[in-house]
Structure formats: structure tokens, C-alpha cells
């Protein structure tokens, strides 16, 4: 089974201050849920509501959880308050730079006059309602999902080519007397809470994660 | 110091072409992604045009077709050519930097004058 | 296309004065947003970058909120060198700007 992807691109650090005290949040209304047999979730898919029968425990198992990957109550910021740095330095997303994340030794955050190879744009996806899963398929996303009378979204954090054709042009620094480039956004995949018949069910999604240079080499012209 | 400078503004008559320029200092062109904003007489700020660090460009609608934005790194300028100018088009001219990473524009030129009139 | 809609688009207040301008984007830009201070003749002056990031050498007094669709400029204590117009900026997209990329503006002049 494949990993959840944790790690997020230069410069786009995932507020996980606020991702922790929203997960607190849903892990509130997932222990009342318990205490009522067969916890009733109900589902809004395509401006529908249906009621269908979710064990909270499908919300227990962390292991495959992805920080890209969010149930709130309300928007997620983009980044985040001071009070918020008791959790985890500098989590904002994504560019706060008065702080330092856990993550930047091997993601440092941007500051004033440094360069990415590609431009790059991180937001929270909160209206996301159909993606492509692991084996190829379609699938149907759960927008939001009623744990014990809270309506919680279904956000994930995506990051993409800022420009929407980089074929047409090369990755910034890049040496183009030698080298062809260009820039292109790659996919993770993420556990999401997706319907299956007509039941919610764990399914790994493709999200965008981040702008990538992908070069090749120039051919050698022989005289 | 980092400095835009823009130049080539002026009075043209309807249907007219003028290129303005904008000439860079302390930075080279070529790394950065550049644009044009123009402001009509006691109007608001107008995004005109954009030309990425790999030489992609992008229009406002009211510039596509009719304007067009290049650089020459040699020069270290930026350009703006400006074909089928209209009354409308009458507005002061601004180059600047778009900031990396947080696409802002934290370097601004002083701004050159099109009129555009008969 | 994303739309920058800036309100209101004149504010009279006095010096002294907490003074608040709101920026709403169509749909969601992240914290891709920029706020700048304009003079008559002038070219624009970055204040504010990232949403709520101080650029450097701007007083303490202004400072920047919101992120996703919904962000506010504050001026603190209004000072008489603060009268100018105010532009908020989306940063997020580049193409398909045919609803420009800034804000219609709001001018704050003297009570």
C-alpha cells in the first residue's frame, strides 16, 4: 500500500499549527459520535444529502493520514496567527518568513531575493468533488461530512504551476545553451473520504504538489 | 540601486503606434517576471501585460493583439509596442518587478505618459 | 477570471484615526495578495506582501489579514503622510486576468 505523501514543496510550508487544532476539533466530535451507536454522517454529494452509516472509527487510523489533507469546521488560513506558533514554529503557509519550520531544513521557506526554479501557487482546495484515484478512476469526493450536528469540509492543500502553459518556456537559471526545460506540476497521492456506492470510504486521490523542472539534455551538434 | 526607468511616452494620433521602454538597473531582466500597469487620468490601477522569467507573455483583454511585450537582455529593457492606439489608451505607464515566489510588485518604475489624441 | 473587489472606494477619517480597507477576491487566491500605497503623481508603494507581510521600511502602523477570498489593509493611528489611495493586488493567477489583477482602489482623504 502506498505511502501518504508528507513532505511539501520549497517555500510551501502546510500550516500544521492549524491543522493540528482543527484535527482537535474533529477528534472532539468523533469521541461524542462514539458514544451514540452507529454514528449517523451524513454526506452532501453534488448539492444532495444522503445519510449513510459511518463508524467513526473510520477517522481513528493516523497512519496514512496526509497534513495535505483536512476536515474543518471553517476555511483553513493560509497562514497562521502568532498564538498558533506554540504548536509548531512558522506554520504558514505559504510565505510567512519571521519563522522557521520543522520542515526547513530539508524544505526551507522562501525569503526576499531567493528564487524558485518554477513559480509555484499553494492553496487549500475546499470544493474539490470528483478525482482520480490510485488505479486510474474516477471517483466521487466527499465535500463535507456531519459528525454529530458539526458540518466538517474536506479541504486539501494543492500546489501547482503558477503558469498554466510552462511547456512554452524554461525553468528560471537554467543554462539553455545545454539544456531543454520546462516546468510541470506533479501529483501526490493522499487519502481522501470518498463515496463508494453508497458508502464513505478511504480511497488514496491524486492531488497537484508541487512545480518541478524537468530537463533533458541538448542534442550535440557535430561540425 | 534597483531602478526602472520607463521612456518613449509621448502624444500619438488614434490608430497610432508608439514602443515604450523600460530600462533596468541594479538587476538583470532576465531572471525576473516583469509587467505593465497603466493609470488613465484619476482612474484606478490597470494591469496591461506580463512577460515571465522565460519569456511567456500574457494580456489584459483590453491589450491583446494590439500590444506586445519583450525584453532584451543585452539592453537589460523591458519593452512595450503599442499598435491601433485608441483614445482610451491615453494613460501614464508603469514597468515594475514582480517579486519571486510571493508575485508582488515591490519594484516600480516612475511612469511615462501616452496621449492619445487627434 | 478573478475579480478584486475593494471597498469602499473613499473613506474620510482624521488623523489619529484606526482606519480599515477591505479587498475580497472572487474566488480563493490563498494569501496571494498585496496591498499598495499611491500618491498623485506618484508611482504605487508596496506596504504589504503574502497578505499580512510588512515590506521593509513601512511603518509598524499598517498591517494586512485575511487569506483565501477575504483580506483586510489597517492603518492603526492615521498620520497626515497616510492621505493617499490604497490598491490591493492578487498574485495567485497570470493568465485570464481580463478582470485586472488589482483592486478599484480607496481613497482615504481628511475628515
Known amino acids: 500500500e502506498p505511502h501518504s505523501e508528507s513532505n511539501v514543496p520549497a517555500g510551501h510550508t502546510i500550516p500544521q499549527a492549524h491543522w493540528t487544532k482543527l484535527q482537535h476539533s474533529l477528534d472532539t466530535a468523533l469521541r461524542r459520535a462514539r458514544s451514540a451507536p452507529a454514528a449517523a454522517i451524513a454526506a452532501r454529494v453534488a448539492g444532495q444529502t444522503r445519510n449513510i452509516t459511518v463508524d467513526p472509527r473510520l477517522f481513528k487510523k493516523r497512519r496514512l493520514r496526509s497534513p495535505r489533507v483536512l476536515f474543518s469546521t471553517q476555511p483553513p488560513r493560509e497562514a497562521a496567527d502568532t498564538q498558533d506558533l506554540d504548536f509548531e514554529v512558522g506554520g504558514a503557509a505559504p510565505f510567512n518568513r519571521t519563522h522557521r519550520s520543522k520542515r526547513s531544513s530539508s524544505h526551507p521557506i522562501f525569503h526576499r531575493g531567493e528564487f524558485s526554479v518554477c513559480d509555484s501557487v499553494s492553496v487549500w482546495v475546499g470544493d474539490k468533488t470528483t478525482a482520480t484515484d490510485i488505479k486510474g478512476k474516477e471517483v466521487m469526493v466527499l465535500g463535507e461530512v456531519n459528525i454529530n450536528n458539526s458540518v466538517f469540509k474536506q479541504y486539501f492543500f494543492e500546489t501547482k504551476c503558477r503558469d498554466p502553459n510552462p511547456v512554452d518556456s524554461g525553468c528560471r537559471g537554467i543554462d539553455s545553451k545545454h539544456w531543454n526545460s520546462y516546468c510541470t506540476t506533479t501529483h501526490t497521492f493522499v487519502k481522501a473520504l470518498t463515496m463508494d456506492g453508497k458508502q464513505a470510504a478511504w480511497r488514496f486521490i491524486r492531488i497537484d504538489t508541487a512545480c518541478v523542472c524537468v530537463l533533458s539534455r541538448k542534442a550535440v551538434r557535430r561540425a | 540601486e534597483v531602478q526602472l526607468v520607463e521612456s518613449g511616452g509621448g502624444l500619438v494620433q488614434p490608430g497610432g503606434s508608439l514602443r515604450l521602454s523600460c530600462a533596468a538597473s541594479?538587476?538583470?531582466?532576465?531572471?525576473?517576471?516583469l509587467v505593465w500597469v497603466r493609470q488613465a487620468p484619476g482612474k484606478g490601477l490597470e494591469w496591461v501585460g506580463f512577460?515571465?522569467?522565460?519569456?511567456?507573455?500574457y494580456y489584459a483583454s483590453s491589450a491583446k493583439g494590439r500590444f506586445t511585450i519583450s525584453r532584451d537582455n543585452s539592453k537589460n529593457t523591458l519593452y512595450l509596442q503599442m499598435n491601433s492606439l485608441r483614445a482610451e489608451d491615453t494613460a501614464v505607464y508603469y514597468c515594475?518587478?514582480?517579486?519571486?515566489?510571493?508575485?508582488?510588485?515591490?519594484?516600480w518604475g516612475q511612469g511615462t505618459l501616452v496621449t492619445v489624441s487627434s | 477570471d478573478i475579480q478584486m473587489t475593494q471597498s469602499p472606494s473613499t473613506l474620510s477619517a482624521s488623523v489619529g484615526d484606526r482606519v480599515t480597507i477591505t479587498c475580497q477576491a472572487s474566488?480563493?487566491?490563498?494569501?496571494?495578495l498585496a496591498w499598495y500605497q499611491q500618491k498623485p503623481g506618484k508611482a504605487p508603494k508596496l506596504l504589504i506582501y503574502?497578505?499580512?507581510n510588512l515590506e521593509s521600511g513601512v511603518p509598524s502602523r499598517f498591517s494586512g489579514s485575511g487569506s483565501g477570498t477575504e483580506f483586510t489593509l489597517t492603518i492603526s493611528s492615521l498620520q497626515p503622510d497616510d492621505f493617499a489611495t490604497y490598491y490591493c493586488?492578487?498574485?495567485?493567477?497570470?493568465?485570464?486576468?481580463?478582470?485586472?489583477?488589482f483592486g478599484g482602489g480607496t481613497k482615504v482623504e481628511i475628515k
Open positions: 515594475a518587478r514582480e517579486t519571486a515566489n510571493t508575485y508582488d510588485y515591490g519594484i
Open positions: 541594479g538587476f538583470t531582466v532576465s531572471g525576473y517576471n
Open positions: 512577460i515571465s522569467y522565460g519569456d511567456t507573455t
Open positions: 474566488q480563493t487566491i490563498s494569501n496571494y
Open positions: 503574502g497578505a499580512s
Open positions: 493586488q492578487q498574485g495567485y493567477t497570470i493568465s485570464n486576468v481580463d478582470n485586472n489583477v
